[in-house]
Interface confidence: low
């Protein structure tokens, strides 16, 4: 089938002891090969500081996955979720202020 770019959605969990969990979800993409990783100051975090979900079919002939990491509250501006899929790539910020999610569709 033709390439379907992912919808990327970044969310923050509740604050716990000065830390927050940030999760980057990619959904509705095809084919299933995708790179999804957290970066700090433009540098990919090491694998042992990130948690990945499996790349799973979402029931519409497309796929979904996620990656999460814990960061210190107040350091959100340093982190971006990096996505690469079928030649497209992009970076997605941690939402600032009271907004706790951020959507972006790659074309």
């Amino acid at each position: 089938g033709s390439t379907v770019p992912p919808m990327v959605n970044v969310t923050c969990s509740e604050v716990s002891e000065g830390n927050i969990t940030v999760t980057c979800r990619a959904s509705s993409f095809y084919p299933r090969n995708i790179t999804l990783t957290w970066r700090q100051d433009g540098v990919s975090l090491s694998h042992n500081t990130q948690q990945w979900g499996d790349v799973l079919p979402d029931g519409n002939g497309t796929y979904q996955t996620w990656v999460a990491t814990r960061i210190r509250q107040g350091e959100e501006q340093r982190f971006t979720c990096y996505m690469e899929h079928s030649g497209n790539h992009g970076t997605h910020p941690v939402p600032s202020g009271n907004s706790h999610h951020h959507h972006h569709h790659h074309h």
Epitope: Q40, D41, G42, V43, S44, R72, E75, Q77, R78, T80, G90, T91, P93
Partner: antibody, heavy 121, light 107 residues
Framework: EVQLVESGGGLVKPGGSLKLSCAAS????????MYWVRQTPEKRLEWVAT????????YYSDSVRGRFTISRDNAENTLYLQMSSLKSEDTAMYYC??????????????WGQGTSVTVSS | DIQMNQSPSSLSASLGDTITITCHAS??????LSWYQQKPGNIPKLLIY???HLHTGVPSRFSGRGSGTGFTLTISSLQPEDIATYYC?????????FGSGTKVEIK
Amino acid sequence: EVQLVESGGGLVKPGGSLKLSCAASGFTFSDYYMYWVRQTPEKRLEWVATISDGITYTYYSDSVRGRFTISRDNAENTLYLQMSSLKSEDTAMYYCSKGGGSTARGALDFWGQGTSVTVSS
Amino acid sequence: DIQMNQSPSSLSASLGDTITITCHASQNIHVWLSWYQQKPGNIPKLLIYGASHLHTGVPSRFSGRGSGTGFTLTISSLQPEDIATYYCLQGQSYPLTFGSGTKVEIK
């Protein structure tokens, strides 16, 4: 070869404004965090500001926050520092530098030659 | 803010000597420390990143060690071209902070 060329420095009166530019070449500019660092006449190095690769995020030192604005034009491969309400303590050599990318966070792997800013009446 | 206490402020050594410069962080910065060399009349240049990794083109007589709060830069077999001021920089959290510098001279 990575090249960073700053311009826009000069002599300005207290309270005045300047806009510094940094023309980048030799690397994929839009993929890297960029930084302004200054060196005081006493040779102390001070981090000034950072901008993320995608223009999304900016960070400032307490001493310049609210007076300086870092920005970038990824189409033109250029980094900027708009400086206003300048004070004598802003007198320094201003360096544009490139984030380390695949090396380590907070490492500045290439620096420009610098542009001198003097704030004096 | 994280303070970086660099010592000594200056040192004088003979050609061929091994010298060590120390940076102490006021809190844990893991390995997010880099070292820079600035020769007289020149710009700073990256020597070491991630506490111990040699930047491209830097001679192997330079080495970095440490993690947490204590870090060292060692120059083995000091050469005339090593006359410079050396600075450390922490990249763990904003504001990024430099050490005050160590001026290295030849006896």
